[in-house]
């Protein structure tokens, strides 16, 4: 049952004389393994013998006999699925039909394969895409229906006979479906490749030429243009004429329209290959090109830069930057449309020419207030001198200048006066908006830049003001030179250094801390009695009567200041002692008599001693001597002595008379 045999292989294989052929082949004999295989060349079935006749190229039998041809022809298959064959070398007369006679135990089959062997290597075939456009990548394919393991080949690409530098990818196929060698080349054709010959060359392993295929490239592209201008440098003066010509060097397909563009914008009613510009003006300066279109798209020529030369136009000045801060740098730029560019500039400041300034830019490294004003310039080129434009204003800003603090009061200023000061300045830009004063005080500012100090203090020494715009400028401090009465007047004892004893020499000093003006007068007073007009008050020999409250008063032309009362204390021994008797110096016996030792002393008497008429001291030491009851024998003269830290004093004698009571007289 023939349907049981299934074969797969290429229908026809191609080769050339001396090459080889490799025949990929698979089969399936379903009833068992292959027992016999014969490869026929052009087999024919003999009905008489019921066998195939023809040249046997290969035979595999059970007895193992193989014809000599078998070295050239090899069966590379097996007994159940592979039927691959190789013929090496292959000859021209191998062309025709190859017959594979297969026999298994019960079945037979003849499978036919066509072999086409040419005398010389046949050419490969170049395949191109249906349309090629410039700059669009395409793949060129070179296909050869040949591949054999025993005969290596290579495919090379050439453009106009020169190997192409793009890398090609070569692939081979030796399968039951197809046998081929293919080379693919990725390529971005330019318009200049149009009409060029591309060759795919077949070479052997040594690079020897075997065959080739050629094609002519048809590269679709936009028109390629050349622009020509008269005059050739495209530099003209106003009023001259200019001619531009557009030439098409290549177009595929043919061009359809022509137009001209200036600075990218289409010029109306200019649809020929020649553009005539008569009596040009400076406005016609610019970049010109022609544009020609075909079905692919528009093509543009290179741009021609038409320069219409003219004398400088009225100039303008640009300032970097205004307003400028004093001390900063400023740059002035003279801007004037001109062609060719100006070669010389003249600069003006407030209408007066600035000497030595001939450049487009003027740089002032350190701006000063006098640099302010209007700056203008004039530009000059080979065609003439431009006009001076309106100019630009430079505003120079600076802190207030020459700031002074001015005292408005008549001099001198006295403590307690109301002082008015003004803050003056010479110039300022921008205007002064506020003022500051040092030191700070709870002072009035009745108007801008005026300070009023009510009841000025003696210690208000200096005042400074600042005038402020964006910056503050301080004036030198001004001395108020406030005049005031003597201050901190006090009495100071300068001698003796210790406590004052009666009879001492005493000096009191009138001190004060400060006075302005310095010339002063002194007054010494004790309880409203004037004592002297010197800075010192002197006592040659102080007496207790000099004790009391002393003050000194110091005055200058501004005022007068008194000291606190200073108490002068004089220490002296007890004096003016006397014995007083109570109830009197005559007392009746039996009554009470009190003797008191009266004295004047500083410090007070600390110790008393009593004496009788015999100068005998009595055992009593207090100020009072109390006799109770008093006896007639107590009659006599008594005296006392007082003692303090300074010394002793004694009283004169005082006589006490004690008389008998009526009772005593009665008894006698």
């Amino acid at each position: 049952d023939s349907s049981k045999w299934v074969f797969e292989h290429p229908e026809t294989l191609y080769a050339w004389e001396g090459a080889c052929v490799w025949i990929p082949c698979t089969y399936r004999a379903l009833d068992g393994d292959l027992e016999s295989f014969i490869l026929f060349h052009n087999p024919e079935y003999n009905k008489n013998t019921s066998k195939f006749d023809g040249t046997r190229l290969y035979e595999s039998t059970k007895d193992g006999k193989v014809p000599s041809e078998q070295k050239r022809v090899q069966f590379l298959g097996d007994k159940n699925k592979n039927c691959t064959l190789s013929i090496h070398p292959v000859h021209l007369n191998d062309s025709g039909q190859l017959g594979l006679r297969m026999e298994s135990k019960t079945e037979k089959w003849m499978e036919r394969i066509h072999l086409n062997v040419s005398e010389r290597p046949f050419p490969p075939h170049i395949q191109l895409p249906p349309e090629i456009q410039e700059s669009q990548e395409v793949t060129l394919t070179c296909l050869l229906n040949f591949s054999c393991y025993g005969y290596p080949i290579q495919l090379q690409w050439l453009l106009e006979g020169v190997p192409m530098r793009q890398a090609a990818v070569t692939s081979t196929s030796l399968t039951i479906k197809s046998v081929f060698t293919r080379s693919e080349l990725k390529f971005s054709p330019q318009w200049s490749h149009h009409g060029k010959i591309v060759t795919c060359q077949l070479q052997d392993a040594d690079g020897k030429f075997l065959s080739n295929d050629t094609v002519q490239l048809n590269v679709k592209h936009t028109p390629k243009l050349e622009i020509k201008v008269t005059p050739s440098d495209a530099i003209v003066r106003e009023g001259d004429s200019v001619t531009m010509t557009c030439e098409v060097s290549s177009s595929n397909p043919e061009y359809t329209t022509v137009s001209w563009l200036k600075d990218g914008t289409s010029l109306k009613k200019q649809n020929t290959f020649t553009l005539n510009l008569r009596e040009v003006t400076k406005d016609q300066s610019g970049k010109y090109c022609c544009q020609v279109s075909n079905d692919v798209g528009p093509g543009r020529s290179e741009e021609v830069f038409l320069q219409v030369q003219y004398a400088p136009e009225p100039s303008t000045v640009q300032i970097l930057h205004s307003p400028a801060v004093e001390g900063s740098q400023v740059e002035f730029l003279c801007m004037s449309l001109a062609n060719p560019l100006p070669t010389n500039y003249t600069w003006y400041h407030n209408g007066k020419e600035m000497q030595g300034r001939t450049e487009e830019k003027v740089h002032i490294p350190k701006i000063l207030p006098w640099h302010a004003g209007t700056y203008s310039c004039v530009a000059e080129n080979i065609l003439g001198t431009g006009q001076r434009g309106p100019g630009a204003e430079l505003d120079v800003q600076y802190p207030p200048k020459k700031v002074t603090t001015v005292i408005q009061n008549p001099m001198p200023i006295r403590e307690g006066d109301t002082v008015t000061l003004s803050c003056n300045y010479n110039s300022s830009n921008p205007s002064v908006t506020r003022y500051e004063w040092k030191p700070h005080g709870a002072w009035e500012e009745p108007s801008l830049g005026v300070l009023k100090i009510q009841n000025v203090g003696w210690d208000n020494t200096t005042i400074a003001c600042a005038a402020c715009n964006s910056w503050c400028s301080w004036a030198s401090p001004v001395a108020l030179n406030v005049q005031y009465a003597p201050r901190d007047v006090r009495v100071r004892k300068i001698k003796p250094l210790s406590e004052i004893h009666s009879g001492n020499s005493v000096s009191l000093q009138c001190d004060f801390s400060s006075s302005h003006p310095k010339e002063v007068q002194f007054f010494w007073e004790k309880n409203g009695r004037l004592l002297g007009k010197e800075s010192q008050l002197n006592f040659d020999s102080i007496s207790p009567e000099d004790a009391g409250s002393y003050s000194c008063w110091v005055n200058n032309s501004i005022g007068q200041t008194a000291s606190k009362a200073w108490t002068l204390e004089v220490l002296y021994a007890p004096r003016r002692l006397r014995v007083s008797m109570s109830p009197g110096d005559q007392v009746m016996e039996g009554k009470s008599a009190t003797l008191t030792c009266e004295s004047d002393a500083n410090p007070p008497v600390s110790h008393y001693t009593w004496f009788d008429w015999n100068n005998q001291s009595l055992p009593y030491h207090s100020q009072k001597l109390r006799l109770e009851p008093v006896k007639v024998q107590h009659s006599g003269a008594y005296w006392c002595q007082g003692t303090n830290s300074v010394g002793k004093g004694r009283s004169p004698l005082s006589t006490l008379t004690v008389y008998y009571s009526p009772e005593t007289i009665g008894r006698r």
Epitope: E415, G416, W458, Y484, A485, F523, E525, G528, L530, W553, N555, S557, I558, G559, Q560, T561, A562
Partner: nanobody
Framework: EVQLVDSGGGLVQAGGSLRVSCEAS????????MGWYRQRPGKERERVAV???????IYADSVKGRFTISRDNAKNTVYLQMNSLEPEDTAVYYC????????WGQGTQVTVSS
């Protein structure tokens, strides 16, 4: 002509208040320090308070916190405001300044009854 005119004295109960005044002429008043003095019965004259030309003040310890001395330069007048008066404050009160030399005003009697 140098002149001092004292006024405002009177009789007041203990704890009461009184203000005495002294108008001065014949000196530059605003530049003079002025003092109030008093003479108590049987006692030496004593200084009670002083107002300096800059209006700073000085008080005797015995009157501190009770008496206030002040001046009005526009009126050439010095004042003594006496509060919390005590019988010991009974005296003739005078105003004076060294600029007046030995000249004293007539004084003004202040009597504090208990």
């Amino acid at each position: 002509e140098v002149q001092l005119v004292d006024s405002g004295g009177g009789l007041v109960q203990a704890g009461g208040s009184l203000r005495v005044s002294c108008e001065a002429s014949g000196i530059t008043f605003s530049r003079a320090a002025m003092g109030w003095y008093r003479q108590r019965p049987g006692k030496e004259r004593e200084r009670v308070a002083v107002v300096n030309s800059d209006s700073s003040t000085i008080y005797a310890d015995s009157v501190k916190g009770r008496f206030t001395i002040s001046r009005d330069n526009a009126k050439n007048t010095v004042y003594l405001q006496m509060n919390s008066l005590e019988p010991e404050d009974t005296a003739v009160y005078y105003c004076w300044s060294p600029g007046f030399g030995s000249y004293w005003g007539q004084g003004t009697q202040v009597t504090v009854s208990s």
